[in-house]
């Protein structure tokens, strides 16, 4: 997860990102039918709050990481779960928060000068279909002029939010991450009562802009818990 | 420079099986989702499955069960294994590179699976 | 599934011309919608991802626009290198889906 520094105070004093449905990314309301499974094209709604086991980091949140929730607990048994603030220890770049990185095992701070399009440095990562172990190893990274000479346009493959230009966020889009526009007043957004409730989404929304919050939309407070709306609304 | 190369194709018989491989080189293939494309002679293009950079699968509702797609980033080789083969499954079949927009920006020349007794 | 409906499916042309092939979905896909170019032995050819985006290398003469369900690929003037079959492909839900293409010939 190499990337650079968060571009805006729009940005960076955002609430937690949210992971959302599938629904038109642009529109004031859309529909929100559930979760997509990696491996099934079946949905499935989304109210049932338990931490949702992961195979990767690009399943879960923008704020998480996949991880075993115990230190020696079983490898194999892995779930989204909150990411490392600054200073806190970390073994790979997805385990800090958006706007930092992971240097000697402890998360540090993004700055402008840090990435300076190639860069040459020791990773540990788990990749690959078998999750049991953390593969450390060392790797030249090229960045490429697409993904990072430049702040990422909408659309454009990132890896966190930092690669992502003023305005947008990196979610998930099927196997990829990409680059989404922040959500607006009145957009539909997606609230998740407990952290990790969205390891297998796959299409995940951005969280609400600046002064904005995810909340039920008034209309739909007499609604069911499954089938109420929330949008993003001023504080 | 960015390059696909399948290999595997041939001709099998119904309710057979082949694996397919794709060569990546040029980038920095862990780095990348991958998918398969298949065309059948004379048709349009269908999108066959897909499987992020660190292993997460994805497959059309048509081979789901019957394919498998993996791959090996230490080799840089994408993977898939066709079971269970029926006529329908007779197309090229190309790997290709995702890149933004979950568009496919690079693609291989294609290898030609036939599936006839 | 999101169907793409591509028209026409075929055309007639002269070099120079200006080229109009149209991409409508079944359902609105914002603007995750890529345009390819294949011809004959040859495997597809990213030309315009996420609707108006031109990839790197391709000639100006090529655009996209639209936004929702209606997509439009335009070649401003028809070079014969251009002679191909054009598909549209949505990247807004699984399962990915093209649209059965279009195939501009020499008139």
């Known amino acids: 997860t190499l990337n650079s520094v968060l571009n805006s105070n729009a940005i960076k004093n955002l609430p937690p990102p949210l992971g959302g449905a599938a629904g038109h990314p642009g529109s004031a309301v859309s529909a929100a039918p559930g979760i997509l499974y990696p491996g099934g094209n079946k949905y499935q709604t989304i109210d049932n709050y338990q931490p949702y086991p992961c195979a990767e980091d690009e399943e879960c949140g923008t704020d998480e990481y996949c991880a075993s929730p115990t230190r020696g607990g079983d490898a194999g048994v892995q779930i989204c779960l909150a990411c490392r603030k600054r200073r806190k220890r970390c073994m790979r770049h997805a385990m800090c928060c958006p706007g930092n990185y992971c240097k000697n095992g402890i998360c540090v701070s993004s700055d402008q000068n840090h990435f300076r399009g190639e860069i040459e440095e020791t990773i540990t990562e788990s990749f690959g279909n078998d999750h049991s172990t953390l593969d450390g190893y060392s790797r030249r990274t090229t960045l490429s002029s697409k993904m990072y000479h430049t702040k990422g346009q909408e659309g454009s493959v990132c890896l966190r939010s930092s690669d992502c230009a003023s305005g947008l966020c990196c979610a998930r889009h099927f196997w990829s991450k990409i680059c989404k526009p922040v959500l607006k007043e009145g957009q539909v957004c997606t609230k998740h009562r407990r952290k990790g409730s969205h390891g297998l989404e796959i299409f995940q929304r951005c969280y609400c802009g600046e002064g904005l919050s995810c909340r039920i939309q008034k209309d739909h407070h007499q609604a069911s818990n499954s089938s109420r709306l929330h949008t993003c609304q001023r504080h | 420079e960015v390059q696909l190369l399948e290999s595997g194709g041939g001709l099998v018989q119904p309710g057979g099986s082949l694996r397919l491989s794709c060569a990546a080189s040029?980038?920095?293939?862990?780095?990348?989702?991958m998918s398969w494309v298949r065309q059948a002679p004379g048709k349009g293009l269908e999108w066959v499955s897909a499987?992020?950079?660190?292993?997460?699968?994805y497959y059309a509702d048509s081979v789901k069960g019957r394919f498998t797609i993996s791959r090996d980033n230490s080799k840089n080789t994408l993977y898939l294994q066709m079971n269970s083969l029926r006529a329908e499954d007779t197309a090229v079949y190309y790997c290709?590179?995702?890149?933004?927009?979950?568009?496919?920006?690079?693609w291989g020349q294609g290898t030609l699976v036939t599936v006839s007794s | 599934d999101i169907q793409m409906t591509q028209s026409p499916s075929s055309l007639s042309a002269s070099v120079g011309d200006r080229v109009t092939i149209t991409c409508r979905s079944s359902?609105?896909?914002?603007?995750?919608l890529n345009w390819y170019q294949q011809k004959p032995g040859k495997a597809p050819k990213l030309l315009i991802y996420?609707?108006?985006r031109l990839e790197s290398g391709v000639p100006s003469r090529f655009s996209g626009s639209g936004s929702g369900t209606d997509f439009t690929l335009t070649i401003s003037s028809l070079q014969p290198e251009d002679f191909a079959t054009y598909y549209c492909?949505?990247?807004?839900?699984?399962?990915?889906?093209f649209g059965g293409g279009t195939k501009v010939e020499i008139k």
């Open positions: 290709a590179r995702g890149g933004d927009w979950v568009a496919f920006d690079y």
């Open positions: 040029g980038f920095n293939f862990r780095d990348y989702a």
């Open positions: 499987i992020s950079g660190r292993g997460s699968v």
């Open positions: 359902q609105s896909i914002s603007n995750y």
């Open positions: 996420g609707a108006s």
């Open positions: 492909q949505q990247s807004y839900s699984l399962p990915l889906t």
